[in-house]
């Protein structure tokens, strides 16, 4: 039960995280005009990964896309790449994890296959979350650097009494969305990896049959002493049922205190 809950929760947390990464990537407010200790302007500037916007006090908002690819800073391109890689990995991870969910039955998929898929999706979520966190952090670092540079050159002389005010930018809402979303995706991935451990069945190379012996409380299985004394790993999660022999496959299909629903 705990494994299914962990897997399900991991999936949901990752889903929220990836939705957040997508939202952050699309948001225009990666950097916003710093209003503190700045001349009050009748316009508010903010920038995203794909376009920059200006909101006037009239309420009119105008956004312009970055229609150049080569003219953009390398750092911005890197951030875009990291966010897109994060989204793609996350989306694939979500697709894989849907089929890996214990509560979803797809044909006669083995638990080992589900475990592998859970681990794969978990790793994908972890890498996706790291990509998002890295992307947002690179952008934040770029902002901090530019902020202090523009603070140093706050007023650029234009000859005589004329001055031009340099607009300073600070952290926008998208950065916080990205950090939180990346963190959630990372946590979801870790939960999927933890769930994978509980999902993985022990290796068996045979069909086990359980007998209820009338004389002794011993489970007779092919495999001699190892099976009868309980040292065999295949006795660990099995219940011996009254009412004759059942194959290992049949036993697993019944819920028991050791089974995970």
């Amino acid at each position: 039960m705990a494994v299914t809950a962990c897997q399900g929760l991991g999936f949901v947390v990752s889903l929220i995280g990836i939705a957040g990464i997508i939202a952050a990537t699309c948001m225009d407010q990666w950097s916003t005009q710093d209003l503190y200790n700045n001349p009050v302007t009748a316009v508010f500037n903010y920038q995203g990964l794909w376009r920059s916007c200006v909101r006037e006090s009239s309420g009119f908002t105008e956004c312009r896309g970055y229609f150049t690819l080569l003219g953009l800073p390398a750092m911005l391109q890197a951030v875009r790449a990291l966010m897109i890689v994060g989204i793609v990995l996350g989306a694939i991870g979500l697709l894989v994890s849907i089929f890996a969910l214990k509560c979803i039955r797809i044909g006669s998929m083995e638990d080992s296959a589900k475990a592998n898929m859970t681990l794969t999706s978990g790793i994908m979520f972890i890498v996706s979350g790291l990509c998002a966190i890295a992307g947002v952090s690179v952008f934040a670092n770029m902002l901090v650097t530019n902020f202090w540079m523009s603070t140093a050159n706050m007023y650029t002389g234009m000859g005589g009494m004329v001055q031009t005010v340099q607009t300073r930018y600070t952290f926008g809402a998208a950065l916080f969305v990205g950090w939180v979303a990346g963190g959630l995706t990372l946590i979801g991935g870790v939960m999927m990896c933890i769930a994978c451990r509980g999902l993985a069945p022990e290796e068996t190379n045979y069909k086990a049959v359980s007998y209820h012996a009338s004389g002794h409380s011993v489970a007779y299985k092919p495999g001699g002493f190892k099976a009868s004394t309980g040292f065999g790993s295949n006795t660990k999660n099995k219940k011996i049922y009254d009412g004759g022999a059942r194959t290992e496959d049949e036993v697993q299909s019944y819920p028991s205190k050791h089974d995970y629903v």
């Epitope: 005009q33 001349p39 009050v40 302007t41 009748a42 316009v43 500037n45 903010y46 920038q47 920059s52 916007c53 200006v54 006037e56 006090s57 009239s58 309420g59 009119f60 105008e62 312009r64 234009m158 004329v162 001055q163 031009t164 005010v165 607009t167």
Partner: antibody, heavy 118, light 113 residues
């Protein structure tokens, strides 16, 4: 047709108070920021205050800060300018104007005259 | 506060002439975000409220005759009236629409010869 009509002007004693109103019609008042601008006799234009569509933010000219208060009643399509501690230099024609693209003022009222004198 | 300096203070012209008046701001009114200059031009006739002619330094307000042209960027702006007509006699003001407090220029009075 967009119309702005100021009212409430008149003669006021120095140190006195006055409240000007600006009735708006012909447009969605609650969607526009509004300005107050004044013009002293035979002088140029002086911006007084701005109030955004949702009543925040509000900005004032340094000369009136702390003495004048701009407010609005969106359901009643009315803009207000509460003036206190009036001085002789506040004597002017007061105009209300609608905020437009580029933060310019596209429609103006006819003005309301305020005279501060003893 | 931003200082808006207009020149000349008055202009005496004859009908049909081309007129140019200038406006200089103490700080750049160019917004880097959209590359727009936040400067407006108004026309005020005696006994009337001002009328918006130009915003964003060069965008003509609807209903304003094509003979009115705004130009300039940063700190230096110009209003040009291509063929002055009798009804254009008025005082022309430029306005800083970028920094609060918003400020108007001293005005340029256009008179007939």
């Amino acid at each position: 047709e967009v119309q702005l009509q100021e009212s409430g002007g008149g003669l006021v004693q120095p140190g006195g108070s006055r409240k000007l109103s600006c009735a708006a019609s012909g447009f969605s008042f609650s969607s526009f920021g509004m300005h107050w601008v004044r013009q002293a006799p035979e002088k140029g234009l002086e911006w007084v205050a701005f109030i955004s569509s949702g009543s925040s933010p509000i900005y004032y000219a340094d000369t009136v800060k702390g003495r004048f208060t701009v407010s609005r009643d969106n359901p009643k399509n009315t803009l207000f300018l509460q003036m206190t501690s009036l001085r002789s230099e506040d004597t002017a024609m007061y105009f209300c104007a609608r905020n437009y693209y580029g933060n310019a003022m596209d429609y103006w009222g006819q003005g309301s005259s305020v005279t501060v004198s003893s | 506060d931003i200082m808006m300096t207009q020149s000349p203070l008055s202009l005496t012209v004859t009908a049909g002439e081309k007129v140019t008046m200038n406006c200089k701001s103490s700080q750049s009114l160019l917004n880097g975000g959209n590359q727009k200059n936040y400067l407006a031009w108004y026309q005020q006739k005696p006994g009337q409220p001002p009328k918006l002619l130009i915003y964003w330094a060069s965008t003509r307000e609807s209903g304003v005759p094509a003979r009115f042209t705004g130009s300039g960027s940063g700190t230096d702006f110009t209003l040009t009236i291509n063929t002055v007509q009798a009804e254009d006699l008025a005082v022309y003001y430029c306005q800083n629409d970028y920094f609060y407090p918003l400020t108007f220029g001293t005005g340029t009075k256009l008179e007939l010869k």
